[in-house]
Interface confidence: low
C-alpha cells in the first residue's frame, strides 16, 4: 500500500495473508469460516500447492501475538475463463482445510448480493484497500498491515483520465478503477488478492479484489480491481457444492 | 377555502371590498391585524388558488400569491400530494430505505432482507446480528462504540 496508514490491530479482521513455503505470496479476504477470496494471478507460478497457508488475525509480520490462526489451503478454484499472465477474471476462491474460529480479530467480510452490490455499493465513492504489499513502487513490503481509502471511478472516467500506454490491458466489465492518478496513493505488489471493502449503513462488504496497475502510484494511472459483483453467483454456487479432489480446480464461468 | 374570512367584520368587508375595489390600506383598517390582512389580500388581489381544491389525497391547501402550498398527509408527497410515498419506495431509490438487501415486488411494497447472520427488525428495514461475529462488523470498534458514554 502506497500512501496509506497502519490498519490498527483488529480493524481489518477479514484480511488474509497467503504464504507459500513460508514466504509472503498475496492477500485475501475471509468471507466465511472456510472460504477466502483472492486473485487468480497469485497462483500463476505455484508449484508446491500443498505448501499454501492462509493466516488470519495477522497484524505485524515481525511478531507473534497469539491472535493469528493458520490454515492449510485445501483447494484453489479459478474461473475457467482466466488465462495465466493476463488480467481479466482475476479471482480465486480458496477453501481452507479446516474452518477458522471467529474472534475479535478474525471476522468475515460480507459477500453481498449481486443486485445490492451493483446498484448500491458501486455508488459508494470511497472504499478501503489493505495489505502487506510494497510501500513504494519497487520498495520494501510492510511489516504492519496497511490500509488506504480510495475513490471509485466509472470505467469511462478512468479511461479518460488515464494516460494512454501502448500495451495497457483493457479495463473490462469484470474490473473497475479506484484510487488517485497524482502518484500519491495506491495498492501495490504484494497487496494482490486483498480486499476492496465498502461500508454501507454500518456493515462492510467485499466489492473488489486488488488486481493490477501500471506500476504502483504511477502518475496518470489508477489501481484496477476485480469487480466482485460479477462473480457472486459463481462464488456462491462453488461454496455450496461438494468438495472435489485436487488442490487446483478450474471451474466454469459463468 | 378561506371560510375564516367570512367571520371577520362582515359588514365592513362587504361594503369596502366586495361591493367596491378596496386598497391594502383599507383592508388593513378592517382587519386591524397585519397577518390577517395579508391572508385576505393574497386571496382578494389575485384570486384564491385553493378554490380548485388542487391538494389530493386529503391534503390541505394554503393560498399564496399566484400559487398555493399543499400540506400532505404522512403517506403522501408531491406538489399536489399526488404521490403515494410507497410508490417511491423501490430498490433503486436509496436502496428502498433498506439497511442491507432490497427486493422489489410487483403490486406490493418492496421488502428488505438481511445477510446471513442478521435478522430483520420489526421496522422492516433494519438488520440486527443474530450471531456473535456477523460478517462486516469490526468487533473492537463495535465494543468501543458500545462503551462510549451516551449524551443525555
Amino acid at each position: 500500500i502506497v500512501g496509506g496508514k497502519v490498519c490498527p490491530k483488529g480493524e481489518c479482521p477479514w484480511q488474509v495473508l497467503l504464504l507459500v513455503n513460508g514466504a509472503q505470496l498475496c492477500g485475501g479476504t475471509l468471507i466465511n469460516t472456510i472460504w477466502v477470496v483472492s486473485a487468480a494471478h497469485c497462483f500463476d507460478k505455484i508449484k508446491n500447492w500443498r505448501n499454501l497457508i492462509a493466516v488470519l488475525g495477522e497484524h505485524d509480520l515481525s511478531e507473534h501475538d497469539g491472535d493469528e490462526q493458520s490454515r492449510r489451503v485445501a483447494q484453489v478454484i479459478i474461473p475457467s475463463t482466466y488465462v495465466p499472465g493476463t488480467t481479466n477474471h482475476d479471482i480465486a476462491l480458496l477453501r481452507l482445510h479446516q474452518p477458522v474460529v471467529l474472534t475479535d480479530h478474525v471476522v468475515p467480510l460480507c459477500l453481498p448480493e449481486r443486485t445490492f452490490s451493483e446498484r448500491t455499493l458501486a455508488f459508494v465513492r470511497f472504499s478501503l484497500v489493505s495489505g502487506w504489499g510494497q510501500l513504494l513502487d519497487r520498495g520494501a513490503t510492510a511489516l504492519e498491515l496497511m490500509v488506504l481509502n480510495v475513490p471509485r471511478l466509472m470505467t469511462q472516467d478512468c479511461l479518460q483520465q488515464s494516460r494512454k500506454v501502448g500495451d495497457s490491458p483493457n479495463i473490462t466489465e469484470y474490473m473497475f478503477c479506484a484510487g488517485y492518478s497524482d502518484g500519491s496513493k495506491d495498492s501495490c505488489k504484494g497487496d494482490s488478492g486483498g480486499p476492496h471493502a465498502t461500508h454501507y449503513r454500518g456493515t462492510w462488504y467485499l466489492t473488489g479484489i486488488v488486481s493490477w496497475g501500471q506500476g504502483c502510484a504511477t502518475v496518470g494511472h489508477f489501481g484496477v480491481y476485480t469487480r466482485v459483483s460479477q462473480y457472486i453467483e459463481w462464488l456462491q454456487k462453488l461454496m455450496r457444492s461438494e468438495p472435489r479432489p485436487g488442490v487446483l480446480l478450474r471451474a466454469p464461468f459463468p | 377555502a378561506n371560510a375564516f374570512l367570512e367571520e371577520l367584520r362582515p359588514g365592513s368587508l362587504e361594503r369596502e371590498c366586495k361591493e367596491e375595489q378596496c386598497s391594502f390600506e383599507e383592508a388593513r383598517e378592517i382587519f386591524k391585524d397585519a397577518e390577517r390582512t395579508k391572508l385576505f389580500w393574497i386571496s382578494y388581489s389575485d384570486g384564491d388558488q385553493c378554490a380548485s381544491s388542487p391538494c389530493q389525497n386529503g391534503g390541505s391547501c394554503k393560498d399564496q400569491l399566484q400559487s398555493y402550498i399543499c400540506f400532505c398527509l404522512p403517506a403522501f408527497e408531491g406538489r399536489n400530494c399526488e404521490t403515494h410515498k410507497d410508490d417511491q419506495l423501490i430498490c433503486v431509490n436509496e436502496n428502498g430505505g433498506c439497511e442491507q438487501y432490497c427486493s422489489d415486488h410487483t403490486g406490493t411494497k418492496r421488502s428488505c432482507r438481511c445477510h446471513e447472520g442478521y435478522s430483520l427488525l420489526a421496522d422492516g428495514v433494519s438488520c440486527t446480528p443474530t450471531v456473535e461475529y456477523p460478517c462486516g462488523k469490526i468487533p473492537i470498534l463495535e465494543k468501543r462504540n458500545a462503551s462510549k458514554p451516551q449524551g443525555r
Partner: antibody
Framework: QVQLQESGPGLVKPSQTLSLTCTVS?????????WSWIRQPPGKGLEWIGY???????NYNPSLKSRVTISVDTSKNQFSLKLSSVTAADTAVYYC???????????????WGQGTSVTVSS | EIVLTQSPATLSLSPGERATLSCRAS??????LHWYQQKPGEAPRLLIK???QPATGIPARFSGSGSGTDFTLTISSLEPEDFAVYYC?????????FGQGTKLEIK
C-alpha cells in the same frame, strides 16, 4: 460412511440435568463440519438446540441458551449435550446431526443419528 | 426469529399424483431454505438444500423452487414410500428454525 449414534439415559427426573453423547464413526469430528443437537417432542415438530464446531465454538438456540452446554471430545470422536433444570416440556426424541457447512452458517443437516428418546418424569 | 409456515397441514393424495407443498417465511431467506422428509420412527432425511439443490441420492421426482419468502417442494409422481411428514428449515438466520410440517397421507 458417516454414522452418528446417540447415547444416554432414557429417563431423567425434573430439575436434573439431561446428558447425552453422540459418537461419530466414519468421519473425523475435528474436520470441517458443524455438529448439532436437534429435538422433537412427541407428535410435534423439530427444534434446533445448538451446534458446535470441532474447534469448540458454539451457537445455541436463544430459547434454551441459559440451560444448554454442547462440548466436543476430539480424542473420542464424540460431542455431548447437557440440558440443565429439565421439566416435562423437555421430553423428546433427541437427534445428533452433522451439517456439511460449505457456506458459512447455512446448516443443511445431511447426516442424522437415529435419535434417542428421553422422558422427563419423577 | 424466523417463523416458517407450511401448508397444507395435511395433504391427501394417491400414488402417481403430483404433490405440491408450500413453505412461507416470515422474512426473506434468499435461498437458504432446506427440505426434509421424516417417516414414523425414523430420523429426518435431507431432500433439498438451498431451495432447489437435490441432496445426494434423492430421486429426480423431488424438486424444490422459490426464493425470498415463498418456497415449494414438488413431488412429480407420488410413490408409496413418499407418504411421510415433510419439514422446511431456515438456514439463513439463527436460531435455525423448522416449519411445523406437512403430513402427506394416502387418500
Amino acid at each position: 460412511q458417516v454414522q452418528l449414534q446417540e447415547s444416554g439415559p432414557g429417563l431423567v427426573k425434573p430439575s436434573q440435568t439431561l446428558s447425552l453423547t453422540c459418537t461419530v464413526s466414519g468421519y473425523s469430528i475435528s474436520s470441517d463440519s458443524a455438529w448439532s443437537w436437534i429435538r422433537q417432542p412427541p407428535g410435534k415438530g423439530l427444534e434446533w438446540i445448538g451446534y458446535i464446531y470441532y474447534s469448540g465454538s458454539t451457537n445455541y438456540n436463544p430459547s434454551l441458551k441459559s440451560r444448554v452446554t454442547i462440548s466436543v471430545d476430539t480424542s473420542k470422536n464424540q460431542f455431548s449435550l447437557k440440558l440443565s433444570s429439565v421439566t416435562a416440556a423437555d421430553t423428546a426424541v433427541y437427534y445428533c446431526a452433522r451439517s456439511v457447512n460449505y457456506y458459512g452458517n447455512s446448516f443443511a443437516v445431511g447426516y442424522w443419528g437415529q435419535g434417542t428418546s428421553v422422558t422427563v418424569s419423577s | 426469529e424466523i417463523v416458517l409456515t407450511q401448508s397444507p397441514a395435511t395433504l391427501s393424495l394417491s400414488p402417481g399424483e403430483r404433490a405440491t407443498l408450500s413453505c412461507r417465511a416470515s422474512q426473506g431467506l434468499s435461498d437458504y431454505l432446506h427440505w426434509y422428509q421424516q417417516k414414523p420412527g425414523e430420523a429426518p432425511r435431507l431432500l433439498i438444500k438451498y431451495a432447489s439443490q437435490p441432496a445426494t441420492g434423492i430421486p429426480a421426482r423431488f424438486s424444490g423452487s422459490g426464493s425470498g419468502t415463498d418456497f415449494t417442494l414438488t413431488i412429480s409422481s407420488l410413490e408409496p414410500e413418499d407418504f411421510a411428514v415433510y419439514y422446511c428449515q431456515n438456514g439463513h438466520s439463527f436460531p435455525l428454525t423448522f416449519g411445523q410440517g406437512t403430513k402427506l397421507e394416502i387418500k
